[in-house]
C-alpha cells in the first residue's frame, strides 16, 4: 500500500472555546467506592446500576439493576448494613448548600420487591440506616423518626419540630452553612443502640425575607431565620434515645460543660467513641475556646455523664480555634485516648496524641507545614494528609504513620507514585483500611486507583480519565506556573495561568482571580478546565491566583493575621503580588482586572476600591459588602462582636461602601443572585446605593430567584457570558 | 430500691384546682421522663400526661390538654400535675409512673381525686 | 390515637390452666413498644411484659407474650392462685400510649 506521507503535527490543536466550558465538554471523573466491609464496595455504573464487587475473590455483580432504579426515578440509593434492603432516592429537592428533601423507596433485595405498608412519608429531610441490622432514622417535618424494621410503622421520637423554628436531627441555616457542613444532625452509635441528635431552636432568631419571583402574579417570600453578627443566635440542646426501646425514657439530654454554658455557646460535632461512649464538642460563642467532652452511659443512672476531668479544652490566644472549623478527634482502639490536628507551640498545626490531658499530648508530626486531615486509625497505623512534601502549601499527600513502632515511623504513601500527574490527593478506606482508593485530582488528569491497605501496592485503575486524555489532545492548554514570591519577611504562593504561546517578551492582559477568605486556599495543584482556563487559551490573558495573608495551611501567623480586621491584609497581599507581576515585564500595566465571588467578591471590590489605580476593571458577583450582614458565626469568628465594646469600629471601617468614592476611576461590574440564602441580595443592594450616592457609575446584573450559587444553566451560561463581554471590552479585545 | 409516693389528692368542686405530687427516690430522678396515669372508678387505665427528664418538653392527653400541667423538680426528686378547670369526669386514682410512653415499669400506690359538688 | 381492644372481657379458668389473653391493635404497633400489666384490687399496676415478649425483672416463666403487628397475646402456661387479676396491654408506640379495656382472669 502507499506509504503515508509524514506531515508534523505544527498548530492544528485548537483553543479552548466558552462554549465548552459552559457544555462542561472538559470535566473529569472520580471514583470513590461505597465501601460495606473490609474488601467490598458497591458503585453505580455509567449505566446506572448499583454493582457489588469483592476486591479479593475479584467477584462482581448487580446488586440492584437501573430497571429498579428507574422505576421510582432513583438518583442515589444506601443499602443496609445486614444487605436486605435499599433505600431509594428520588425527587431530590435542594435546599441550602448540603440540605435537600427527597423522597424515599425501600426495596427488599430478597423478595426483589418494595417493601408495601407504612411506606415513608414524604418529603423526607434526611434518612439514615442504623450502622448495624436495617433499623432506620429519619426526619420528616423537623422531628426524628424511628423503623425498627423498613416495614414496621413509626416511632415518633420528637414533638417539638416546627417550621423555622425548632430543627430536631437536621440544622438550621447557620449551623449547616457555618458548622457542620453536613444535612444532618443526627449520629447513630457504633452498634445502633443509641442514636444521639441536637435540637436547634430558632425561635428568638430574627428572619431574613426575600422575594422568589418564579411565575405568579405575586412574588412569595422566603423566610429563613438567619443570625447575623451579633443577633440570638440558636439554642442547641444534644439528647440521646435508646433506639431499642425509645418510649421507655425518651430522649436523654446530654449536658453542656459548665464551661461552655456559662455564656453563648456552639455546639460543634459529635462522634461516637464506643456503643455506649460519645464524644461532643462545643465552642464558645468568642470562637477562641473550644471544649471537647468525653460523655459515658451509666446503666445504673440510666443517663449520659461527662466528667470534668474528660473535658479537654482547646484554646487561640492569637485568633479562633482550630482552622475554618475545629478538628474532630480520632479514637484509638482503646476508646480513650485519641489523635487530634491542632497548633503546635510554633503555631502550626499538626496530629498531636491526647492520652489524659492536652497539656500532656505527645505531638506526632512536626514542622513547618500542616497536617490537615486524619483519615482512618487502625490498630498499628494512622493515615493523614499533610502539604509537607517539597514545601509546596497546595499540595496534598497522604502519609502513615505506623503507631506500632516506637517511635512511630512515617512513609509517604503517594508522594512518588505519579509526581508529575498527581500531588493532590485524598482517600477513601474500607472498614478497617484493609484496602483503601486514591484519589488524585491533579496537576495532571485526575486518577482514581485502589490499593492494598498493610503495603500500599496499587491493585488497579478505577478512573483514568482517558476520554478526557483523548478529547484534550487537540486542545491548546495554557501552562500552569505554582511559584512563590517574597515581600518583605512575607512569602505569597501564587499559581499562574499563561496563555499557550505565551511569550515573556510580550505584554499581556492580567486577571486576578481572587478569593482570600480566611483558612481558604486557592493556589492548589489540581486540574481543572473552567473559565479562567479558556480567558487563557483563547483570549490571550494571563490570570493569577494568589494566597495572601488569611489563608490556609502556612502556619498561624499568615493565618491569624487577618483576626479582627477583615478586609485588610488580603486586599494588600493582592495589591503587592500584582506590583510584583508587573514586575516581572510581561503584564500589560493599562489592562490588569480582578474578580472574585462571594468573599472573593468582597476582596475584589475593596481591591478595586484601594485607590491605587493598579486596576482598570472587576468584577464582584455575590459579594459581602459588610460584615454585620453576614451569619453571625462566621462573621464573629474572624471579626468578633459588632459592638461598641467589642470590634464595631472595624465592623463599620471595613465595609464596601464605606469605600464608594473609591470607585469612580475604575469600570465595576456588580453581580448577585437576588434569591441568594447565604450572602444576601441585601449586601449587592447596600453597594449599589451607596455608588449612586456617591454618584459613581458602575455596571450591575441581578439574576432573578438564583442563589449564591448561580447555578441554573441558563443564568450561568447568561453569567459567563456577560462577564466575558465586560472583560474584553475593558481589556480591548475584539470579539 | 424504687418508690413513688403520690399526694395532694381529695375532694374538690367542679371548676376547681389541685396539684398532685410524686416524690421519687431510689432511681436517678432526673435521668428519666416520668408520667401520670389516672384510672376512674371501676374502669381502665388512661395516660394522663408525661414529662421528659430535664422538664424540656412535656406531652398532654386531648382530654386535659390547657387544663393540666405537668412539671418536675429535679433538685427535690419530685413530679407535680397541676390540674385546673376540674370536671366530674377527672374523678379518678391518679398514678405516677416511671417512663415516657411506656412500659411504665414502677408505679406509685396512686391518689384519689374526687371531682364534686 | 391507637385503639387497643381485649378479649375476652372476661375469663374464668381454674388453678393450673392455661390462660390466653388477646390483644388487638387498631392500627400496627411495633413489637417493641407493646406491653403486659397485671392490676390486683386496690393496688396500683405491675409490668408483667416488655417489648412484646420480654419478661420484666422478677415475673415468673409461667407469663410469656407474643404477637407483632396489629395481633398479641399474653399466656399463663399454669395459672397459680395469686395470678387471678386484671391485666391490661398497653402501647408506646404513638401518643397518646393507649391501654386496652382490661381482661379479667377470674377462678372458675
Known amino acids: 500500500r502507499p506509504s503515508r506521507v509524514y506531515k508534523p503535527e505544527g498548530n492544528t490543536k485548537r483553543a479552548l472555546t466558552l462554549k465548552d466550558i459552559l457544555n462542561g465538554t472538559f470535566s473529569y471523573k472520580t471514583y470513590f467506592p461505597n465501601w460495606i466491609s473490609e474488601q467490598e464496595y458497591l458503585h453505580q455504573s455509567e449505566d446506572d446500576n448499583i454493582v457489588f464487587y469483592n476486591i479479593e475473590t475479584r467477584e462482581s455483580y448487580i446488586i440492584l439493576s437501573n430497571s429498579t432504579m428507574k422505576s421510582v426515578n432513583a438518583t442515589d440509593y444506601g443499602l443496609s448494613p445486614d444487605r436486605q434492603f435499599v433505600y431509594l432516592e428520588s425527587d431530590y429537592s435542594k435546599l441550602w448548600r448540603y440540605s435537600y428533601t427527597a423522597t424515599y423507596y425501600i426495596y427488599d433485595l430478597q423478595n426483589g420487591e418494595f417493601v408495601r405498608g407504612y411506606e415513608l412519608p414524604r418529603p423526607i429531610q434526611y434518612l439514615c440506616w442504623s450502622p448495624v441490622g436495617s433499623k432506620l432514622a429519619y426526619v420528616y417535618q423537623n422531628n426524628i423518626y424511628l423503623k425498627q424494621r423498613p416495614g414496621d410503622p413509626p416511632f415518633q421520637i420528637t414533638y417539638t419540630g416546627r417550621e423555622n423554628r425548632i430543627f430536631n436531627g437536621i440544622p438550621d441555616w447557620v449551623y449547616e452553612e457555618e458548622m457542620l457542613a453536613t444535612k444532618y444532625a443526627l449520629w447513630w452509635s457504633p452498634d445502633g443502640k443509641f442514636l444521639a441528635y441536637v435540637e436547634f431552636n430558632d425561635s428568638d432568631i430574627p428572619i431574613i425575607a426575600y422575594s422568589y419571583y418564579g411565575d405568579g402574579q405575586y412574588p412569595r417570600t422566603i423566610n429563613i431565620p438567619y443570625p447575623k453578627a451579633g443577633a440570638k443566635n440558636p439554642v442547641v440542646r444534644v439528647f440521646i434515645v435508646d433506639t431499642t426501646y425509645p418510649h421507655h425514657v425518651g430522649p436523654m439530654e446530654v449536658p453542656v460543660p459548665e464551661m461552655i454554658a456559662s455564656s453563648d455557646y456552639y455546639f460543634s460535632w459529635l462522634t461516637w467513641v464506643s456503643s455506649e461512649r460519645v464524644c461532643l464538642q462545643w465552642l464558645k460563642r468568642v470562637q477562641n475556646v473550644s471544649v471537647l467532652s468525653i460523655c459515658d452511659f451509666r446503666e445504673d443512672w440510666h443517663a449520659w455523664e461527662c466528667p470534668k476531668n474528660q473535658e479537654h479544652v482547646e484554646e487561640s490566644r492569637t485568633g479562633w480555634a482550630g482552622g475554618f472549623f475545629v478538628s474532630t478527634p480520632a479514637f484509638s482502639q482503646d476508646a480513650t485516648s485519641y489523635y487530634k490536628i491542632f497548633s503546635d507551640k510554633d503555631g502550626y498545626k499538626h496530629i498531636h496524641y491526647i492520652k489524659d490531658t492536652v497539656e500532656n499530648a505527645i505531638q506526632i508530626t512536626s514542622g513547618k507545614w500542616e497536617a490537615i486531615y486524619i483519615f482512618r486509625v487502625t490498630q498499628d497505623s494512622l493515615f493523614y494528609s499533610s502539604n509537607e512534601f517539597e514545601g509546596y502549601p497546595g499540595r496534598r499527600n497522604i502519609y502513615r504513620i505506623s503507631i506500632g513502632n516506637s517511635p512511630p515511623s512515617k512513609k509517604c504513601v503517594t508522594c512518588h507514585l505519579r509526581k508529575e500527574r498527581c500531588q493532590y490527593y485524598t482517600a477513601s478506606f474500607s472498614y478497617k483500611a484493609k484496602y483503601y482508593a486514591l484519589v488524585c485530582y491533579g496537576p495532571g488528569l485526575p486518577i482514581s486507583t485502589l490499593h492494598d491497605g498493610r503495603t500500599d501496592q496499587e491493585i488497579q485503575v478505577l478512573e483514568e480519565n482517558k476520554e478526557l486524555e483523548n478529547s484534550l489532545r487537540n486542545i491548546q492548554l495554557p501552562k500552569v506556573e505554582i511559584k512563590k514570591l517574597k515581600d518583605g519577611g512575607l512569602t505569597f504562593w501564587y499559581k499562574m495561568i499563561l496563555p499557550p504561546q505565551f511569550d515573556r517578551s510580550k505584554k499581556y492582559p492580567l486577571l486576578i482571580q481572587v478569593y482570600g477568605g480566611p483558612c481558604s486556599q486557592s493556589v492548589k495543584s489540581v486540574f481543572a478546565v473552567n473559565w479562567i482556563t479558556y480567558l487563557a487559551s483563547k483570549e490571550g490573558i494571563v490570570i493569577a491566583l494568589v494566597d495572601g495573608r488569611g489563608t490556609a495551611f502556612q502556619g498561624d501567623k499568615f493565618l491569624h493575621a487577618v483576626y479582627r480586621k477583615l478586609g485588610v491584609y488580603e486586599v494588600e497581599d493582592q495589591l503587592t503580588a500584582v506590583r510584583k507581576f508587573i514586575e516581572m515585564g510581561f503584564i500589560d500595566e493599562e489592562r490588569i482586572a480582578i474578580w472574585g465571588w462571594s468573599y472573593g467578591g468582597y476582596v475584589s471590590s475593596l481591591a478595586l476600591a484601594s485607590g491605587t489605580g493598579l486596576f482598570k476593571c472587576g468584577i464582584a458577583v455575590a459579594p459581602v459588602s459588610s460584615w454585620e450582614y453576614y451569619a453571625s458565626i462566621y462573621s464573629e469568628r474572624f471579626m468578633g462582636l459588632p459592638t461598641k465594646d467589642d470590634n464595631l469600629e472595624h465592623y463599620k471601617n471595613s465595609t464596601v461602601m464605606a469605600r464608594a468614592e473609591y470607585f469612580r476611576n475604575v469600570d465595576y461590574l456588580l453581580i448577585h443572585g437576588t434569591a441568594d440564602d447565604n450572602v444576601h441580595f441585601q449586601n449587592s443592594a447596600q453597594i449599589a446605593k451607596a455608588l449612586v450616592n456617591a454618584q459613581v457609575d458602575f455596571q450591575a446584573m441581578w439574576y432573578s430567584d438564583q442563589n449564591h450559587g448561580i447555578l441554573s444553566g441558563r443564568s450561568q451560561n447568561h453569567l459567563y457570558t456577560h462577564m466575558t463581554h465586560f472583560l474584553k471590552q475593558c481589556f480591548s479585545l475584539s470579539d | 430500691e424504687v418508690q413513688l409516693l403520690e399526694s395532694g389528692g381529695g375532694l374538690v368542686q367542679p371548676g376547681g384546682s389541685l396539684r398532685l405530687s410524686c416524690a421519687a427516690s431510689?432511681?436517678?430522678?432526673?435521668?428519666?421522663?416520668m408520667s401520670w396515669v389516672r384510672q376512674a372508678p371501676g374502669k381502665g387505665l388512661e395516660w394522663v400526661s408525661a414529662?421528659?427528664?430535664?422538664?424540656?418538653?412535656?406531652y398532654y392527653a386531648d382530654s386535659v390538654k390547657g387544663r393540666f400541667t405537668i412539671s418536675r423538680d429535679n433538685s427535690k426528686n419530685t413530679l407535680y400535675l397541676q390540674m385546673n378547670s376540674l370536671r366530674a369526669e377527672d374523678t379518678a386514682v391518679y398514678y405516677c409512673?416511671?417512663?415516657?410512653?411506656?412500659?411504665?415499669?414502677?408505679w406509685g400506690q396512686g391518689t384519689l381525686v374526687t371531682v364534686s359538688s | 390515637e391507637i385503639v387497643l381492644t381485649q378479649s375476652p372481657g372476661t375469663l374464668s379458668l381454674s388453678p393450673g390452666e392455661r390462660a390466653t389473653l388477646s390483644c388487638r391493635a387498631s392500627?400496627?404497633?411495633?413489637?417493641?413498644?407493646l406491653a403486659w400489666y397485671q392490676q390486683k384490687p386496690g393496688q396500683a399496676p405491675r409490668l408483667l411484659i416488655y417489648?412484646?415478649?420480654s419478661r420484666a425483672t422478677g415475673i415468673p416463666d409461667r407469663f410469656s407474650g407474643s404477637g407483632s403487628g396489629t395481633d398479641f397475646t399474653l399466656t399463663i402456661s399454669r395459672l397459680e392462685p395469686e395470678d387471678f387479676a386484671v391485666y391490661y396491654c398497653?402501647?408506646?408506640?404513638?401518643?397518646?400510649?393507649?391501654f386496652g379495656q382490661g381482661t379479667k382472669v377470674e377462678i372458675k
Open positions: 417489648g412484646a415478649s
Open positions: 398497653q402501647q408506646g408506640h404513638i401518643i397518646p400510649p393507649t
Open positions: 409512673a416511671k417512663a415516657w410512653m411506656g412500659p411504665f415499669d414502677y
Open positions: 431510689g432511681f436517678t430522678f432526673s435521668s428519666y421522663a
Open positions: 414529662i421528659s427528664g430535664s422538664g424540656g418538653s412535656t
Open positions: 392500627q400496627s404497633v411495633s413489637s417493641s413498644y
